[in-house]
Interface confidence: low
């Protein structure tokens, strides 16, 4: 007869490991007992369990409650055992020794490999600001056994670098994603992808990029200067900018306080019916936590009567 087993048994942390050992004997042969032991190099054998044809299963104290026979029906020639709830410390070499009658003893070895799936973590880098050079956007760390693979999935242009730290029973892999921040990256996803043989599917952690910036400010509303005449209603100036975080707006007048009746509503400056008092230099001040910008415009309120008088003069002069 001969023993049938596996060279390597692989389980994920916390799963039950079936350690196979089947005696394929000739007819009339019987298995008296099967002894399982852990036999790592450099250490003495440590008994797991004894399967006795007459007395049944005896589990050594070190494995009490952790070693079982597979559920019925059982073949009397099957010496396989279940090691419950595999932990990293279980990884190593195991031996089954089968005592048969009348053929004698046989032994076989297998290696138990316990995969420890990673629990990845993603850490954003320092605050990203437009104008910075190459900057750390995020780092992703995953520890497992064997070492996990850490990659990035993103539309954003950047560079990656990885480093690995070996521990006694596992390895930690850290990958960093660096980029040159630009406002177009705002809201873009940066996804850390962790692959590992102990995972049914890749694990993904997504970080949404936030890049601080502040666009140049400009003022709209003076495109047609002729509309800014005495008596006109609904005149307004609008300050244009964009930023991350969203900016706040402040209006001032360079050559004095804002005239009475002028309403400030965020980015908009609303005027009452125009008078010559409203002529002046107006400044829009845009700011966020990242930066601040100014834009100034000159408002010149026209007096239509003065203009028509001038026109008459011009006509008569011709």
């Amino acid at each position: 007869g001969e023993l049938e087993t596996s060279d390597v048994v692989t389980v994920v942390l916390g799963q039950d490991a079936k350690l196979p050992c089947f005696y394929r004997g000739d007819s009339g042969e019987q298995v008296g007992q099967v002894a399982w032991a852990r036999v790592d190099a450099g250490e003495g054998a440590q008994e797991l369990a004894l399967l006795h044809s007459k007395y049944g299963l005896h589990v050594s104290p070190a494995y009490e409650g952790r070693v079982e026979q597979p559920p019925p029906p059982r073949n009397p020639l099957d010496g396989s055992v279940l090691l419950r709830n595999a932990v990293q410390a279980d990884e190593g070499e195991y031996e089954c020794r089968v005592s048969t009658f009348p053929a004698g003893s046989f032994q076989a070895r297998l290696r138990l490999r316990v995969l420890v799936p990673p629990l990845p973590s993603l850490n954003p880098g320092p605050a990203l600001e437009e104008g910075q050079g190459l900057t750390l956007a995020a780092s992703c760390t995953a520890e497992g056994s064997p070492a996990p693979s850490v990659t990035w999935d993103t539309e954003v242009k950047g560079t990656t670098s990885s480093r690995s730290f070996k521990h006694s029973r596992s390895a930690a892999v850290t990958s960093e994603f660096h980029l040159v921040p630009s406002r177009s990256m705002n809201g873009q996803p940066l996804t850390c992808v962790v692959s590992h043989p102990g995972l049914l599917q890749d694990q993904r952690i997504t970080h949404i990029l936030h890049v601080s910036f502040l666009a140049e400010a400009s003022v709209r509303g003076l495109e047609d200067q002729n509309l800014w005449h005495i008596g006109r209603e609904g005149a307004m100036l609008k300050c244009l900018s964009e930023g991350q975080p969203p900016p706040s707006y402040n209006w001032t007048r360079l050559d004095g306080p804002l005239p009475s009746g002028v309403r400030v509503d965020g980015d908009t400056l609303g005027f009452p019916p125009l008078t010559t008092e409203h002529s002046g230099i107006y400044v829009c001040h845009v700011s966020n936590e990242f930066s601040s910008r100014d834009s100034q415009v000159t408002v010149d309120v026209l007096d239509p009567q003065e203009d028509s008088g001038k026109q008459v003069d011009l006509v008569s002069a011709s």
């Epitope: 440590q46 104290p61 070190a62 009490e64 409650g65 952790r66 709830n85 932990v87 410390a89 521990h167």
Partner: antibody, heavy 122, light 107 residues
Framework: EVQLVESGGGLVQPGGSLRLSCAAS????????MSWVRQAPGKGLEWVSG????????RYADSVKGRFTISRDNSKNTLYLQMNSLRAEDTAVYYC???????????????WGQGTLVTVSS | DIQMTQSPSSLSASVGDRVTITCRAS??????LAWYQQKPGKAPKLLIY???SLQSGVPSRFSGSGSGTDFTLTISSLQPEDFATYYC?????????FGQGTKVEIK
Amino acid sequence: EVQLVESGGGLVQPGGSLRLSCAASGGSFYGFGMSWVRQAPGKGLEWVSGIYSHDADKRYADSVKGRFTISRDNSKNTLYLQMNSLRAEDTAVYYCARQTEDRSYGYDLDYWGQGTLVTVSS
Amino acid sequence: DIQMTQSPSSLSASVGDRVTITCRASQGISSYLAWYQQKPGKAPKLLIYAASSLQSGVPSRFSGSGSGTDFTLTISSLQPEDFATYYCQQHYTTPPTFGQGTKVEIK
């Protein structure tokens, strides 16, 4: 049969230090995680700290974190608990116990010592 | 931390009685539960592990059942040596936590 014997308990003033030892004999020590569990007079059981077989992974209850340090010497089959900055509420019988598996975070405890009394009082 | 709540906190029973103690976890702990017996002045003794497995050398009158959040320790026929305090303990997460104990007294 595994035997665990604690020592090192006694009376100490608040703010003082003690080092408890737990000597194992009669069975495997290296291949197992070990824990310290305490019991204040007339109270229930409270897990204090646990250690993996190879000394790399150590865990602590929040109530002792930063004050107590667990360690082991596998060559001497001995477990230790260094207790610093002791408080009145640390008064208890301290048991060392062997875990049925080599994991520092939990697992049922199959062998226990007889305990050693630590009294923190001025 | 996971809270373990035992009930009752104490009970009186006679030799030969069937005694049931329950333990409830504040969140699911699968079968990561152990039961211990403690007599005055002595260390706790493991009775049941993995919620329902009898520790070697423990009399078969002790049994455990349950999974998830609700667990039960049953003593089928109380013996004089069973008068003690019983604790449940979860070890699903760190820190492992114990129930407050159930004292079984002679009626």
